[in-house]
Amino acid sequence: ETDEEPEEPGRRGSFVEMVDNLRGKSGQGYYVEMTVGSPPQTLNILVDTGSSNFAVGAAPHPFLHRYYQRQLSSTYRDLRKGVYVPYTQGKWEGELGTDLVSIPHGPNVTVRANIAAITESDKFFINGSNWEGILGLAYAEIARPDDSLEPFFDSLVKQTHVPNLFSLQLCGAGFPLNQSEVLASVGGSMIIGGIDHSLYTGSLWYTPIRREWYYEVIIVRVEINGQDLKMDCKEYNYDKSIVDSGTTNLRLPKKVFEAAVKSIKAASSTEKFPDGFWLGEQLVCWQAGTTPWNIFPVISLYLMGEVTNQSFRITILPQQYLRPVEDVATSQDDCYKFAISQSSTGTVMGAVIMEGFYVVFDRARKRIGFAVSACHVHDEFRTAAVEGPFVTLDMEDCGYNIPQTDESTLMT
Protein backbone atom coordinates (compact mmCIF):
# COMPACT_ATOMS: atom_id res chain seq x y z
CA GLU A 1 0.00 0.00 0.00
CA THR A 2 1.42 3.42 0.89
CA ASP A 3 4.52 2.17 2.71
CA GLU A 4 5.28 5.01 5.12
CA GLU A 5 7.91 3.27 7.25
CA PRO A 6 11.52 4.39 6.76
CA GLU A 7 13.72 2.01 4.75
CA GLU A 8 17.30 3.01 5.43
CA PRO A 9 19.17 5.90 7.07
CA GLY A 10 19.11 9.11 5.08
CA ARG A 11 16.13 8.07 2.98
CA ARG A 12 13.59 10.36 4.59
CA GLY A 13 13.09 13.57 6.51
CA SER A 14 14.34 17.07 5.74
CA PHE A 15 16.63 18.08 2.88
CA VAL A 16 16.59 21.83 3.49
CA GLU A 17 19.60 22.56 1.29
CA MET A 18 17.86 21.01 -1.73
CA VAL A 19 14.40 22.54 -1.34
CA ASP A 20 13.66 25.20 -3.97
CA ASN A 21 16.73 24.28 -6.04
CA LEU A 22 14.80 24.26 -9.34
CA ARG A 23 13.75 27.20 -11.47
CA GLY A 24 11.90 27.58 -14.73
CA LYS A 25 8.40 26.94 -15.93
CA SER A 26 6.57 24.03 -17.49
CA GLY A 27 6.68 25.41 -21.04
CA GLN A 28 10.46 25.57 -21.17
CA GLY A 29 11.57 23.06 -18.58
CA TYR A 30 12.86 23.08 -15.02
CA TYR A 31 16.57 23.46 -14.39
CA VAL A 32 19.03 22.98 -11.56
CA GLU A 33 22.36 24.73 -11.08
CA MET A 34 25.36 22.44 -11.55
CA THR A 35 29.11 22.96 -11.69
CA VAL A 36 31.47 21.15 -14.04
CA GLY A 37 35.24 21.09 -14.19
CA SER A 38 38.11 22.54 -12.16
CA PRO A 39 37.86 25.37 -11.37
CA PRO A 40 34.07 24.92 -11.32
CA GLN A 41 32.05 26.32 -14.22
CA THR A 42 28.44 27.04 -13.26
CA LEU A 43 25.68 26.03 -15.68
CA ASN A 44 21.91 25.71 -15.50
CA ILE A 45 20.89 22.19 -16.47
CA LEU A 46 17.45 20.94 -17.53
CA VAL A 47 16.16 18.13 -15.32
CA ASP A 48 14.95 15.42 -17.72
CA THR A 49 13.63 12.07 -16.55
CA GLY A 50 12.96 11.14 -20.19
CA SER A 51 16.59 10.72 -21.28
CA SER A 52 19.88 9.41 -19.90
CA ASN A 53 22.72 11.61 -21.11
CA PHE A 54 24.35 14.45 -19.24
CA ALA A 55 24.94 16.86 -22.11
CA VAL A 56 25.96 20.51 -22.01
CA GLY A 57 26.49 23.28 -24.51
CA ALA A 58 30.21 23.42 -25.18
CA ALA A 59 30.39 25.92 -28.03
CA PRO A 60 28.89 29.34 -28.68
CA HIS A 61 25.21 29.29 -29.66
CA PRO A 62 22.85 32.25 -30.13
CA PHE A 63 20.51 30.95 -27.41
CA LEU A 64 23.21 30.27 -24.79
CA HIS A 65 24.38 32.83 -22.22
CA ARG A 66 27.34 30.62 -21.30
CA TYR A 67 28.75 27.23 -22.16
CA TYR A 68 31.17 24.58 -20.86
CA GLN A 69 34.75 25.42 -21.78
CA ARG A 70 36.63 22.15 -21.60
CA GLN A 71 39.99 23.76 -22.26
CA LEU A 72 39.64 25.70 -18.98
CA SER A 73 39.12 22.55 -16.89
CA SER A 74 42.20 20.81 -15.50
CA THR A 75 40.12 17.71 -14.69
CA TYR A 76 38.52 17.21 -18.12
CA ARG A 77 39.30 13.90 -19.79
CA ASP A 78 38.52 13.34 -23.46
CA LEU A 79 36.95 9.96 -24.26
CA ARG A 80 37.82 10.44 -27.96
CA LYS A 81 34.35 9.43 -29.00
CA GLY A 82 31.52 11.33 -30.64
CA VAL A 83 27.83 11.18 -29.88
CA TYR A 84 24.92 12.06 -32.16
CA VAL A 85 21.37 12.31 -30.81
CA PRO A 86 18.60 12.86 -33.36
CA TYR A 87 15.03 13.61 -32.23
CA THR A 88 11.83 13.52 -34.29
CA GLN A 89 12.46 17.25 -34.63
CA GLY A 90 15.99 18.51 -34.18
CA LYS A 91 19.18 16.97 -32.85
CA TRP A 92 22.36 17.56 -30.89
CA GLU A 93 25.82 16.19 -31.41
CA GLY A 94 29.01 16.42 -29.48
CA GLU A 95 32.12 14.88 -28.01
CA LEU A 96 32.24 12.57 -25.02
CA GLY A 97 34.46 13.14 -22.04
CA THR A 98 34.43 13.00 -18.25
CA ASP A 99 34.87 15.71 -15.66
CA LEU A 100 34.13 16.51 -12.03
CA VAL A 101 30.53 17.48 -11.43
CA SER A 102 28.65 18.77 -8.41
CA ILE A 103 25.26 20.22 -7.58
CA PRO A 104 25.64 23.30 -5.31
CA HIS A 105 22.11 22.93 -3.91
CA GLY A 106 22.30 19.15 -3.79
CA PRO A 107 24.28 16.53 -1.87
CA ASN A 108 27.69 17.76 -0.72
CA VAL A 109 29.63 15.48 -3.08
CA THR A 110 31.64 15.71 -6.28
CA VAL A 111 31.56 12.91 -8.84
CA ARG A 112 33.39 12.13 -12.04
CA ALA A 113 30.70 11.79 -14.64
CA ASN A 114 30.34 11.31 -18.37
CA ILE A 115 29.64 14.57 -20.16
CA ALA A 116 28.57 15.04 -23.76
CA ALA A 117 30.01 18.36 -24.87
CA ILE A 118 27.45 19.65 -27.38
CA THR A 119 29.24 21.24 -30.31
CA GLU A 120 26.33 21.39 -32.75
CA SER A 121 22.56 21.37 -32.31
CA ASP A 122 19.28 22.06 -34.06
CA LYS A 123 15.98 22.78 -32.30
CA PHE A 124 17.46 21.73 -28.96
CA PHE A 125 18.31 24.86 -26.98
CA ILE A 126 15.34 27.17 -26.35
CA ASN A 127 15.67 30.92 -26.70
CA GLY A 128 15.09 32.50 -23.28
CA SER A 129 14.86 29.22 -21.37
CA ASN A 130 17.96 30.04 -19.26
CA TRP A 131 19.37 26.48 -19.33
CA GLU A 132 22.56 25.40 -21.06
CA GLY A 133 22.46 21.63 -20.79
CA ILE A 134 20.41 18.59 -19.93
CA LEU A 135 20.61 16.09 -17.08
CA GLY A 136 19.16 12.80 -18.28
CA LEU A 137 18.01 10.95 -15.17
CA ALA A 138 16.63 7.79 -16.81
CA TYR A 139 18.46 4.47 -17.19
CA ALA A 140 21.54 3.40 -19.17
CA GLU A 141 19.46 1.41 -21.65
CA ILE A 142 18.48 4.60 -23.48
CA ALA A 143 21.82 6.40 -23.14
CA ARG A 144 23.56 7.43 -26.37
CA PRO A 145 25.62 6.23 -28.13
CA ASP A 146 24.84 3.01 -26.24
CA ASP A 147 24.09 1.58 -22.80
CA SER A 148 27.78 1.38 -21.87
CA LEU A 149 27.81 5.14 -21.22
CA GLU A 150 27.03 5.36 -17.51
CA PRO A 151 24.36 8.01 -16.74
CA PHE A 152 25.06 10.72 -14.17
CA PHE A 153 22.81 9.32 -11.44
CA ASP A 154 24.41 5.86 -11.70
CA SER A 155 27.84 7.49 -11.30
CA LEU A 156 26.59 9.51 -8.33
CA VAL A 157 25.23 6.46 -6.51
CA LYS A 158 28.31 4.34 -7.30
CA GLN A 159 30.86 6.92 -6.17
CA THR A 160 29.10 8.24 -3.04
CA HIS A 161 26.79 7.16 -0.24
CA VAL A 162 23.81 8.89 -1.81
CA PRO A 163 20.83 6.48 -1.76
CA ASN A 164 19.55 5.34 -5.18
CA LEU A 165 16.50 7.56 -5.23
CA PHE A 166 15.53 11.11 -6.11
CA SER A 167 12.28 13.03 -5.94
CA LEU A 168 10.85 15.96 -7.87
CA GLN A 169 8.42 18.68 -6.95
CA LEU A 170 7.69 20.83 -10.01
CA CYS A 171 5.70 23.93 -9.16
CA GLY A 172 3.63 25.43 -11.96
CA ALA A 173 3.07 29.14 -11.31
CA GLY A 174 -0.61 29.18 -12.23
CA PHE A 175 0.00 32.44 -14.06
CA PRO A 176 2.38 33.41 -16.86
CA LEU A 177 5.88 34.50 -15.90
CA ASN A 178 7.91 37.04 -17.82
CA GLN A 179 11.68 36.61 -18.16
CA SER A 180 12.62 38.55 -15.03
CA GLU A 181 9.96 36.79 -12.96
CA VAL A 182 11.26 33.37 -14.06
CA LEU A 183 14.77 34.30 -12.99
CA ALA A 184 13.44 35.32 -9.58
CA SER A 185 10.81 32.61 -9.21
CA VAL A 186 10.95 29.30 -7.36
CA GLY A 187 10.29 26.43 -9.71
CA GLY A 188 10.39 23.53 -7.29
CA SER A 189 12.75 20.99 -5.79
CA MET A 190 14.89 18.06 -6.80
CA ILE A 191 15.71 16.07 -3.68
CA ILE A 192 18.67 13.83 -4.44
CA GLY A 193 18.90 10.73 -2.29
CA GLY A 194 15.66 11.11 -0.41
CA ILE A 195 12.14 12.28 0.27
CA ASP A 196 11.22 15.57 1.94
CA HIS A 197 7.94 15.39 3.88
CA SER A 198 7.37 19.13 3.65
CA LEU A 199 6.87 18.91 -0.11
CA TYR A 200 3.70 16.83 -0.10
CA THR A 201 0.47 16.23 1.74
CA GLY A 202 -1.25 12.92 2.43
CA SER A 203 0.32 9.59 1.55
CA LEU A 204 2.74 8.47 -1.12
CA TRP A 205 1.39 5.77 -3.42
CA TYR A 206 3.79 3.68 -5.48
CA THR A 207 3.54 2.17 -8.94
CA PRO A 208 6.11 -0.34 -10.24
CA ILE A 209 8.68 0.73 -12.80
CA ARG A 210 7.78 -1.77 -15.51
CA ARG A 211 11.18 -1.73 -17.17
CA GLU A 212 14.32 0.24 -16.39
CA TRP A 213 14.88 2.27 -19.56
CA TYR A 214 12.55 5.23 -19.48
CA TYR A 215 10.63 5.51 -16.21
CA GLU A 216 7.95 3.25 -17.64
CA VAL A 217 4.69 2.71 -15.74
CA ILE A 218 1.33 1.11 -16.48
CA ILE A 219 -1.95 3.03 -16.64
CA VAL A 220 -4.92 0.74 -16.04
CA ARG A 221 -7.89 3.13 -16.32
CA VAL A 222 -8.63 6.73 -17.31
CA GLU A 223 -11.55 8.82 -16.10
CA ILE A 224 -12.77 12.28 -17.08
CA ASN A 225 -14.84 13.77 -14.22
CA GLY A 226 -15.30 10.24 -12.87
CA GLN A 227 -16.52 8.87 -16.21
CA ASP A 228 -14.48 5.90 -17.41
CA LEU A 229 -13.10 6.32 -20.96
CA LYS A 230 -13.89 2.59 -21.29
CA MET A 231 -11.02 1.77 -23.59
CA ASP A 232 -8.98 -1.42 -23.67
CA CYS A 233 -6.31 -0.49 -21.12
CA LYS A 234 -3.58 -1.56 -23.58
CA GLU A 235 -4.46 1.58 -25.57
CA TYR A 236 -3.43 3.77 -22.63
CA ASN A 237 0.08 2.31 -22.73
CA TYR A 238 0.54 2.00 -26.49
CA ASP A 239 3.45 1.71 -27.01
CA LYS A 240 4.54 2.73 -23.49
CA SER A 241 3.71 5.14 -20.67
CA ILE A 242 6.51 7.17 -19.15
CA VAL A 243 7.06 9.86 -16.52
CA ASP A 244 9.04 12.64 -18.20
CA SER A 245 9.95 15.93 -16.55
CA GLY A 246 11.46 17.14 -19.83
CA THR A 247 8.09 17.18 -21.62
CA THR A 248 5.61 20.00 -21.09
CA ASN A 249 2.30 18.36 -21.90
CA LEU A 250 0.34 15.30 -20.94
CA ARG A 251 0.76 13.43 -24.21
CA LEU A 252 -1.65 10.63 -25.08
CA PRO A 253 -1.78 7.99 -27.82
CA LYS A 254 -3.94 9.09 -30.77
CA LYS A 255 -7.05 7.00 -29.91
CA VAL A 256 -6.85 7.92 -26.23
CA PHE A 257 -6.31 11.61 -27.02
CA GLU A 258 -9.37 11.67 -29.29
CA ALA A 259 -11.54 9.96 -26.68
CA ALA A 260 -10.25 12.23 -23.91
CA VAL A 261 -10.83 15.42 -25.91
CA LYS A 262 -14.33 14.27 -26.84
CA SER A 263 -15.07 13.71 -23.16
CA ILE A 264 -13.48 17.00 -22.00
CA LYS A 265 -15.40 18.87 -24.74
CA ALA A 266 -18.66 17.30 -23.59
CA ALA A 267 -17.96 18.15 -19.95
CA SER A 268 -17.11 21.78 -20.78
CA SER A 269 -19.81 22.30 -23.43
CA THR A 270 -21.29 25.39 -21.73
CA GLU A 271 -18.64 27.27 -23.73
CA LYS A 272 -17.77 26.67 -27.39
CA PHE A 273 -14.01 26.48 -27.76
CA PRO A 274 -12.36 26.66 -31.17
CA ASP A 275 -10.95 23.49 -32.73
CA GLY A 276 -7.55 25.18 -32.64
CA PHE A 277 -7.70 25.27 -28.85
CA TRP A 278 -7.87 21.47 -28.60
CA LEU A 279 -4.95 21.28 -31.04
CA GLY A 280 -2.88 23.62 -28.84
CA GLU A 281 -2.85 26.31 -31.54
CA GLN A 282 -5.35 28.85 -30.23
CA LEU A 283 -5.41 30.35 -26.77
CA VAL A 284 -8.60 30.80 -24.82
CA CYS A 285 -8.93 33.86 -22.63
CA TRP A 286 -11.14 35.19 -19.91
CA GLN A 287 -11.26 38.55 -18.20
CA ALA A 288 -8.55 38.56 -15.53
CA GLY A 289 -9.59 36.51 -12.50
CA THR A 290 -12.73 35.05 -14.09
CA THR A 291 -11.42 31.76 -15.53
CA PRO A 292 -14.33 29.30 -15.12
CA TRP A 293 -12.29 26.41 -13.75
CA ASN A 294 -15.48 24.68 -12.65
CA ILE A 295 -16.64 24.01 -16.22
CA PHE A 296 -13.56 21.90 -16.92
CA PRO A 297 -13.40 18.31 -15.72
CA VAL A 298 -10.78 16.65 -13.55
CA ILE A 299 -8.72 13.89 -15.18
CA SER A 300 -7.85 10.72 -13.30
CA LEU A 301 -5.18 8.23 -14.30
CA TYR A 302 -5.28 4.90 -12.47
CA LEU A 303 -1.83 3.39 -12.06
CA MET A 304 -0.90 -0.20 -11.28
CA GLY A 305 -0.28 -0.57 -7.55
CA GLU A 306 2.42 -2.53 -5.76
CA VAL A 307 0.01 -5.21 -4.61
CA THR A 308 -1.63 -7.73 -6.97
CA ASN A 309 -5.00 -6.51 -8.29
CA GLN A 310 -4.59 -3.15 -6.54
CA SER A 311 -4.39 0.24 -8.23
CA PHE A 312 -4.49 3.86 -7.15
CA ARG A 313 -5.47 7.02 -8.99
CA ILE A 314 -3.89 10.39 -9.50
CA THR A 315 -6.25 13.22 -10.34
CA ILE A 316 -5.30 16.50 -11.98
CA LEU A 317 -7.29 19.71 -12.29
CA PRO A 318 -7.74 22.08 -15.24
CA GLN A 319 -5.25 24.29 -13.36
CA GLN A 320 -2.68 21.69 -14.42
CA TYR A 321 -3.80 20.96 -17.99
CA LEU A 322 -4.61 24.54 -19.00
CA ARG A 323 -1.22 26.22 -19.21
CA PRO A 324 -1.12 29.99 -18.64
CA VAL A 325 0.42 31.88 -21.56
CA GLU A 326 1.33 35.56 -21.66
CA ASP A 327 0.43 37.40 -24.86
CA VAL A 328 0.85 41.16 -25.05
CA ALA A 329 -2.06 41.46 -27.49
CA THR A 330 -4.46 40.04 -24.91
CA SER A 331 -2.62 41.08 -21.75
CA GLN A 332 -5.77 42.35 -20.02
CA ASP A 333 -7.08 38.76 -19.97
CA ASP A 334 -5.96 35.47 -18.46
CA CYS A 335 -5.10 33.26 -21.44
CA TYR A 336 -4.39 29.53 -21.59
CA LYS A 337 -3.16 26.82 -23.88
CA PHE A 338 -4.60 23.29 -23.79
CA ALA A 339 -1.64 21.25 -22.55
CA ILE A 340 -2.83 17.77 -23.53
CA SER A 341 -1.64 16.65 -26.92
CA GLN A 342 -1.43 13.68 -29.23
CA SER A 343 1.52 11.28 -29.22
CA SER A 344 2.76 8.58 -31.55
CA THR A 345 5.16 7.19 -28.93
CA GLY A 346 2.80 6.37 -26.08
CA THR A 347 1.63 8.27 -23.01
CA VAL A 348 3.99 10.89 -21.67
CA MET A 349 3.23 12.15 -18.20
CA GLY A 350 5.00 15.48 -18.53
CA ALA A 351 5.07 18.63 -16.43
CA VAL A 352 1.28 18.94 -16.70
CA ILE A 353 0.95 15.81 -14.56
CA MET A 354 4.06 16.29 -12.45
CA GLU A 355 3.09 19.82 -11.39
CA GLY A 356 0.21 18.31 -9.44
CA PHE A 357 2.35 15.89 -7.49
CA TYR A 358 5.48 15.19 -5.54
CA VAL A 359 7.03 12.36 -7.55
CA VAL A 360 9.51 9.92 -6.01
CA PHE A 361 11.79 8.03 -8.40
CA ASP A 362 12.67 5.14 -6.12
CA ARG A 363 15.22 3.39 -8.30
CA ALA A 364 16.40 1.20 -5.43
CA ARG A 365 12.98 -0.43 -5.18
CA LYS A 366 12.06 -0.09 -8.87
CA ARG A 367 8.99 2.04 -8.23
CA ILE A 368 7.63 5.57 -8.62
CA GLY A 369 5.71 7.27 -5.84
CA PHE A 370 3.04 9.96 -6.15
CA ALA A 371 1.66 12.26 -3.46
CA VAL A 372 -0.26 15.53 -3.70
CA SER A 373 2.24 18.35 -4.11
CA ALA A 374 2.31 21.03 -1.46
CA CYS A 375 2.76 23.60 -4.25
CA HIS A 376 0.12 22.52 -6.78
CA VAL A 377 -2.25 25.15 -8.14
CA HIS A 378 -5.89 24.59 -7.17
CA ASP A 379 -9.01 26.49 -6.15
CA GLU A 380 -11.30 26.46 -3.13
CA PHE A 381 -13.53 23.74 -4.57
CA ARG A 382 -11.16 21.08 -5.93
CA THR A 383 -7.65 19.84 -5.32
CA ALA A 384 -5.37 17.37 -7.06
CA ALA A 385 -5.57 13.96 -5.41
CA VAL A 386 -3.80 10.64 -4.98
CA GLU A 387 -6.26 8.02 -3.78
CA GLY A 388 -6.48 4.27 -3.32
CA PRO A 389 -6.58 1.40 -3.12
CA PHE A 390 -8.91 0.29 -5.93
CA VAL A 391 -9.43 -3.27 -7.05
CA THR A 392 -8.35 -3.73 -10.67
CA LEU A 393 -7.93 -7.15 -12.27
CA ASP A 394 -5.59 -8.32 -15.02
CA MET A 395 -3.45 -5.19 -14.86
CA GLU A 396 -0.48 -6.99 -16.41
CA ASP A 397 -2.52 -7.18 -19.62
CA CYS A 398 -2.49 -3.38 -19.82
CA GLY A 399 1.21 -3.30 -20.67
CA TYR A 400 2.11 -3.25 -24.33
CA ASN A 401 4.98 -5.49 -25.44
CA ILE A 402 7.03 -3.63 -28.00
CA PRO A 403 8.02 -6.07 -30.75
CA GLN A 404 11.74 -6.89 -30.58
CA THR A 405 13.72 -5.92 -33.67
CA ASP A 406 17.02 -7.01 -32.15
CA GLU A 407 18.50 -9.68 -34.46
CA SER A 408 19.51 -11.81 -31.48
CA THR A 409 15.86 -12.44 -30.70
CA LEU A 410 14.91 -13.54 -34.22
CA MET A 411 14.40 -17.26 -34.97
CA THR A 412 17.03 -18.67 -37.32
Epitope: G27, Q28, T88, Q89, I126, N127, G128, E271, K272, F273, P274, D275, G276, G280, E281, Q282, L283, V284, C285, D327, V328, A329, T330, C335
Partner: antibody
Protein backbone atom coordinates in the same frame (compact mmCIF):
# COMPACT_ATOMS: atom_id res chain seq x y z
CA UNK B 1 7.78 44.05 -29.14
CA UNK B 2 6.45 41.22 -31.28
CA UNK B 3 7.50 41.53 -34.91
CA UNK B 4 7.11 39.38 -38.02
CA UNK B 5 9.52 40.44 -40.75
CA UNK B 6 8.63 39.11 -44.21
CA UNK B 7 10.93 38.78 -47.22
CA UNK B 8 10.77 41.23 -50.11
CA UNK B 9 8.66 41.25 -53.29
CA UNK B 10 9.11 38.47 -55.84
CA UNK B 11 8.71 38.52 -59.61
CA UNK B 12 8.62 34.95 -60.90
CA UNK B 13 7.89 33.17 -64.15
CA UNK B 14 4.91 30.84 -64.61
CA UNK B 15 5.77 27.24 -63.68
CA UNK B 16 8.57 28.33 -61.35
CA UNK B 17 8.50 28.19 -57.57
CA UNK B 18 9.24 30.69 -54.80
CA UNK B 19 10.13 30.54 -51.10
CA UNK B 20 8.87 33.31 -48.83
CA UNK B 21 10.22 33.85 -45.33
CA UNK B 22 8.87 35.27 -42.10
CA UNK B 23 11.31 36.03 -39.27
CA UNK B 24 9.80 36.33 -35.80
CA UNK B 25 11.14 38.30 -32.85
CA UNK B 26 9.98 39.67 -29.51
CA UNK B 27 8.50 36.46 -28.08
CA UNK B 28 9.32 32.78 -27.48
CA UNK B 29 9.17 31.48 -31.04
CA UNK B 30 8.20 27.89 -30.19
CA UNK B 31 5.21 28.97 -28.08
CA UNK B 32 2.97 30.13 -30.93
CA UNK B 33 1.98 28.75 -34.33
CA UNK B 34 2.64 30.70 -37.52
CA UNK B 35 -0.02 31.01 -40.22
CA UNK B 36 0.19 32.05 -43.86
CA UNK B 37 -2.56 33.91 -45.70
CA UNK B 38 -3.21 35.07 -49.25
CA UNK B 39 -4.96 38.23 -50.40
CA UNK B 40 -5.92 39.01 -53.97
CA UNK B 41 -7.69 42.22 -54.96
CA UNK B 42 -11.43 41.79 -54.66
CA UNK B 43 -11.11 38.26 -53.29
CA UNK B 44 -10.60 38.90 -49.59
CA UNK B 45 -8.26 36.95 -47.33
CA UNK B 46 -7.67 33.21 -47.61
CA UNK B 47 -6.03 31.04 -44.97
CA UNK B 48 -3.33 28.81 -46.51
CA UNK B 49 -2.14 26.83 -43.51
CA UNK B 50 -0.13 26.88 -40.30
CA UNK B 51 2.92 25.38 -38.68
CA UNK B 52 3.84 24.68 -35.06
CA UNK B 53 7.48 25.79 -34.63
CA UNK B 54 7.93 23.50 -31.61
CA UNK B 55 7.63 20.31 -33.68
CA UNK B 56 7.07 21.40 -37.32
CA UNK B 57 3.53 19.96 -37.32
CA UNK B 58 1.59 21.47 -40.22
CA UNK B 59 -2.06 21.84 -41.13
CA UNK B 60 -3.21 23.09 -44.53
CA UNK B 61 -6.33 24.42 -46.15
CA UNK B 62 -7.25 21.62 -48.58
CA UNK B 63 -7.33 24.20 -51.38
CA UNK B 64 -3.59 24.94 -50.95
CA UNK B 65 -2.30 21.46 -50.08
CA UNK B 66 -0.70 20.90 -53.47
CA UNK B 67 0.51 24.49 -53.76
CA UNK B 68 2.14 25.43 -50.44
CA UNK B 69 4.71 23.77 -48.17
CA UNK B 70 5.46 25.27 -44.77
CA UNK B 71 8.76 24.75 -42.96
CA UNK B 72 10.50 26.25 -39.95
CA UNK B 73 14.03 26.94 -38.76
CA UNK B 74 13.97 27.47 -35.00
CA UNK B 75 17.62 28.47 -34.82
CA UNK B 76 16.78 31.65 -36.75
CA UNK B 77 13.12 31.89 -35.60
CA UNK B 78 12.09 31.86 -39.24
CA UNK B 79 9.14 30.23 -41.00
CA UNK B 80 9.11 29.57 -44.72
CA UNK B 81 6.39 29.03 -47.31
CA UNK B 82 7.34 27.36 -50.56
CA UNK B 83 4.89 27.91 -53.43
CA UNK B 84 5.26 25.61 -56.42
CA UNK B 85 4.12 25.50 -60.07
CA UNK B 86 3.17 29.16 -60.05
CA UNK B 87 0.45 30.55 -62.27
CA UNK B 88 -1.15 33.97 -62.58
CA UNK B 89 -3.67 32.81 -59.96
CA UNK B 90 -0.85 32.83 -57.44
CA UNK B 91 -0.09 36.51 -58.00
CA UNK B 92 -1.13 38.01 -54.68
CA UNK B 93 -0.05 39.56 -51.44
CA UNK B 94 0.99 36.96 -48.86
CA UNK B 95 1.03 37.46 -45.11
CA UNK B 96 2.40 35.50 -42.22
CA UNK B 97 0.56 35.90 -38.93
CA UNK B 98 1.13 34.59 -35.42
CA UNK B 99 -1.52 32.73 -33.48
CA UNK B 100 -2.71 33.59 -29.99
CA UNK B 101 -6.40 34.33 -30.04
CA UNK B 102 -7.13 34.54 -33.77
CA UNK B 103 -4.22 36.45 -35.40
CA UNK B 104 -2.96 39.18 -33.08
CA UNK B 105 0.24 39.84 -35.08
CA UNK B 106 0.82 40.11 -38.81
CA UNK B 107 3.86 40.42 -41.04
CA UNK B 108 4.17 43.47 -43.28
CA UNK B 109 3.19 41.60 -46.54
CA UNK B 110 5.08 40.06 -49.45
CA UNK B 111 3.91 40.76 -52.99
CA UNK B 112 4.35 37.88 -55.43
CA UNK B 113 3.90 38.64 -59.11
CA UNK B 114 3.79 35.77 -61.61
CA UNK B 115 4.52 37.01 -65.09
CA UNK B 116 6.23 35.78 -68.20
CA UNK C 1 -15.98 25.45 -45.03
CA UNK C 2 -17.73 28.12 -42.97
CA UNK C 3 -18.81 31.06 -45.09
CA UNK C 4 -18.50 34.48 -43.49
CA UNK C 5 -20.77 37.00 -45.21
CA UNK C 6 -20.41 40.76 -44.91
CA UNK C 7 -23.44 41.76 -46.91
CA UNK C 8 -22.48 45.42 -47.26
CA UNK C 9 -19.38 45.98 -49.38
CA UNK C 10 -19.53 49.72 -48.68
CA UNK C 11 -21.07 51.82 -45.93
CA UNK C 12 -21.42 55.57 -45.89
CA UNK C 13 -20.82 57.46 -42.68
CA UNK C 14 -19.63 60.80 -41.38
CA UNK C 15 -16.93 61.73 -38.87
CA UNK C 16 -18.49 61.66 -35.39
CA UNK C 17 -21.22 59.20 -36.41
CA UNK C 18 -21.87 55.73 -35.03
CA UNK C 19 -21.77 52.89 -37.56
CA UNK C 20 -22.35 49.13 -37.32
CA UNK C 21 -20.69 46.61 -39.62
CA UNK C 22 -22.32 43.19 -39.69
CA UNK C 23 -21.07 39.69 -40.43
CA UNK C 24 -22.99 36.43 -40.71
CA UNK C 25 -21.51 32.94 -40.33
CA UNK C 26 -23.00 30.03 -42.29
CA UNK C 27 -22.99 27.92 -39.12
CA UNK C 28 -22.61 28.34 -35.37
CA UNK C 29 -19.12 29.55 -34.50
CA UNK C 30 -19.82 30.36 -30.86
CA UNK C 31 -17.97 33.56 -30.01
CA UNK C 32 -14.90 32.60 -32.00
CA UNK C 33 -14.87 35.63 -34.26
CA UNK C 34 -12.27 38.36 -34.75
CA UNK C 35 -12.43 41.72 -36.50
CA UNK C 36 -9.60 43.41 -38.40
CA UNK C 37 -9.11 46.83 -39.93
CA UNK C 38 -7.11 47.23 -43.15
CA UNK C 39 -5.73 50.36 -44.73
CA UNK C 40 -5.12 49.85 -48.45
CA UNK C 41 -1.58 48.59 -49.07
CA UNK C 42 -1.03 47.63 -45.42
CA UNK C 43 -1.39 44.53 -43.25
CA UNK C 44 -4.65 43.92 -41.40
CA UNK C 45 -4.71 45.40 -37.88
CA UNK C 46 -6.45 43.28 -35.21
CA UNK C 47 -9.30 44.99 -33.37
CA UNK C 48 -11.56 42.45 -31.66
CA UNK C 49 -11.28 38.80 -30.59
CA UNK C 50 -13.77 36.42 -28.97
CA UNK C 51 -16.52 38.51 -30.61
CA UNK C 52 -16.34 41.32 -28.06
CA UNK C 53 -12.85 41.59 -26.50
CA UNK C 54 -10.64 44.44 -27.65
CA UNK C 55 -6.99 43.67 -28.36
CA UNK C 56 -4.55 45.70 -26.27
CA UNK C 57 -4.26 49.29 -27.45
CA UNK C 58 -7.47 49.32 -29.49
CA UNK C 59 -9.54 52.47 -28.80
CA UNK C 60 -12.76 51.85 -26.90
CA UNK C 61 -14.84 53.40 -29.69
CA UNK C 62 -14.60 49.93 -31.29
CA UNK C 63 -17.10 47.47 -29.82
CA UNK C 64 -17.83 43.91 -30.89
CA UNK C 65 -20.97 41.92 -30.16
CA UNK C 66 -22.80 38.77 -31.18
CA UNK C 67 -22.52 35.00 -30.88
CA UNK C 68 -23.54 31.94 -32.84
CA UNK C 69 -24.00 33.19 -36.41
CA UNK C 70 -24.56 36.97 -36.19
CA UNK C 71 -21.81 39.43 -35.33
CA UNK C 72 -21.50 43.19 -35.28
CA UNK C 73 -18.60 45.62 -35.09
CA UNK C 74 -19.77 49.03 -33.90
CA UNK C 75 -17.64 52.14 -34.27
CA UNK C 76 -18.90 55.06 -32.24
CA UNK C 77 -17.63 58.58 -32.90
CA UNK C 78 -16.12 57.63 -36.27
CA UNK C 79 -12.74 59.26 -36.92
CA UNK C 80 -11.29 60.07 -40.35
CA UNK C 81 -8.68 57.31 -39.88
CA UNK C 82 -11.53 54.79 -39.55
CA UNK C 83 -12.58 55.25 -43.16
CA UNK C 84 -10.94 52.02 -44.24
CA UNK C 85 -11.93 48.37 -44.78
CA UNK C 86 -13.09 46.01 -41.99
CA UNK C 87 -13.00 42.20 -42.11
CA UNK C 88 -14.51 39.59 -39.84
CA UNK C 89 -12.92 36.16 -39.39
CA UNK C 90 -14.06 32.92 -37.82
CA UNK C 91 -11.41 30.88 -36.01
CA UNK C 92 -13.84 28.30 -34.71
CA UNK C 93 -12.86 25.59 -37.17
CA UNK C 94 -10.43 24.90 -39.98
CA UNK C 95 -10.00 26.21 -42.57
CA UNK C 96 -10.18 29.66 -41.00
CA UNK C 97 -12.30 31.94 -43.18
CA UNK C 98 -12.83 35.68 -43.59
CA UNK C 99 -15.65 37.93 -44.63
CA UNK C 100 -15.31 39.78 -47.94
CA UNK C 101 -14.81 43.11 -46.18
CA UNK C 102 -16.81 46.30 -45.66
CA UNK C 103 -15.36 49.66 -46.65
CA UNK C 104 -16.37 52.79 -44.77
CA UNK C 105 -16.76 55.86 -46.96
CA UNK C 106 -17.57 59.49 -46.34
CA UNK C 107 -21.23 60.30 -46.95
Amino acid sequence: EVQLQQSGPELVKPGASVKLSCKASGYTFTNFWIHWLKQRPGQGLEWIGMIDPSDSYTKYNQKFKAKATLTVDTSSSTTYMHLSSLTSEDSAVYYCARSGVAFPYWGQRTLVTVSA
Amino acid sequence: DILMTQSQKFMSTSVGDRVSVTCKASQNVGRNVAWYQQISGQSPKPLIYSASHRYSGVPDRFTGSGSGTDFTLTISNVQSEDLVEFFCQQYNSYPYTFGGGTKLEIK
